[in-house]
């Protein structure tokens, strides 16, 4: 019997409000045995894959996606999915990345702590299931 794949989670370090030119790392988490994590931008039109997966906890694995120098164009909605043979998971909730002008003044607000949710629930979409990463049919326009 094929197991039910839990939905992944997504968070951002150091937070979801990032000054222009600073770095941000998206962290995707899923169960043990994930082969590929994918970070999707907006509505699956662009994505990045990684097989560089690490052991996050006894029950979880994770992957990290870093943007070295955030631009205004990086603002938007991000979510994770993963491939655990033989199928893809559902998507995580969306996480919204906000890019702010770097004022540099003493009153600059702190970046928000990383969030593993996001106010927006994504619609159910199981179209990834049963497809290996290479046969996804999506255009791998890189996110950064």
């Amino acid at each position: 019997q094929e197991e039910d794949l839990p939905r992944p989670s997504i968070s951002a370090e150091p937070g979801t409000v990032i000054p222009l030119g600073s770095h941000v790392t998206f962290v995707c988490r899923g169960p043990v045995g994930v082969q590929t994590f994918r970070l999707e931008r907006d509505s699956r039109s662009t994505y990045n894959d990684t097989e560089d997966v690490s052991q996050a906890s006894p029950s979880e694995s994770e992957a990290r996606f870093r943007i070295d120098s955030v631009r205004e164009g990086n603002a938007g909605l991000y979510r994770c999915i993963y491939y655990k043979p033989p199928k893809w998971s559902e998507q995580s909730d969306y996480l919204e990345l906000l890019v702010k002008e770097s004022s540099g003044g003493p009153d600059s607000p702190d970046t928000e702590p990383g969030s593993s949710a996001g106010p927006t629930q994504r619609p159910s979409d199981n179209s990834h299931n049963e497809h290996a990463p290479a046969s996804q049919g999506l255009k791998a326009e890189h996110l950064y």
């Epitope: 082969q35 052991q55 029950s59 990290r64």
Partner: antibody, heavy 119, light 107 residues
């Protein structure tokens, strides 16, 4: 088809240096963690080093037996993995395998290159 | 470091036999265990990851089980082409460590 081709092995004197290379093809090199694993003649397998991808800041990890002497590196533009080996000892004699890893297990292996440390 | 104790170090069996190899970790590795097959003069081949997950193209006579510190690798019906050395490996924490290997021979 995944291909990993090691080169650079050979005979070297104790205390000497050698640099191994691994040319990778058939997969997206820059999104994968990569490893070196070695096997002394007639012995078992020993993990040597790991390098993560750019998204994980190219973090490196080493076995205690080689730490401070060996350096793992990668050139994503050339799809090539390296192992710089300094202060070589006779116990470093082994076949060195370049490996494409998953989350710490070793999914695809090269054919290996023999390093012999002897005077 | 996590020590992996693999047994037996060698075994002899007949074609069609059920063969079992065990691997014991010195601490819990949370099913981060792989099994490899190595034939003489060749590179190892990954058979199983995450303790039980069979790699694509690996015959179904191979299987893995276990959790915590104790793991088992089984060949349900030994075939002549299965003659090789088998290794377990933990990847819960670095340094990643291998068992000492089990050399499998045909009786």
């Amino acid at each position: 088809e995944v291909q990993l081709v090691e080169s650079g092995g050979g005979l070297v004197q104790p205390g000497g240096s050698l640099k191994l290379s691994c040319a990778a093809s058939g997969f997206t090199f820059n999104t994968n963690a990569m490893y070196w694993v070695r096997q002394a003649p007639g012995k078992g397998l020993e993990w040597v080093a790991r390098i993560r991808s750019k998204s994980s800041n190219y973090a490196t990890y080493y076995a205690a037996s080689v730490k401070g002497r060996f350096t793992i590196s990668r050139d994503d533009s050339k799809n090539t993995l390296y192992l710089q080996m300094n202060s070589l000892k006779t116990e470093d004699t082994a076949v060195y395998y370049c490996v494409r890893g998953g989350s710490g297990f070793f999914a695809y292996w090269g054919q290996g290159t023999l390093v012999t440390v002897s005077s | 470091d996590i020590q992996m104790t693999q047994s037996p170090s060698s075994l002899s069996a007949s074609v069609g036999d059920r063969v079992t190899i065990t691997c014991k970790a010195s601490e819990d590795i949370y099913i981060r265990l792989a099994w490899y097959q190595q034939k003489p003069g060749k590179a190892p081949r990954l058979l199983i990851s995450t303790a039980t997950s069979l790699e694509t193209g690996v015959p179904s006579r191979f299987s893995g089980s276990g959790s915590g510190t104790d793991y088992t690798f089984t060949i349900s019906s030994l075939q002549p082409e299965d003659i090789a050395t088998y290794y377990c490996q933990q990847y819960w924490s670095t340094p990643y460590t291998f068992g000492g290997g089990t050399r499998l021979e045909i009786k």
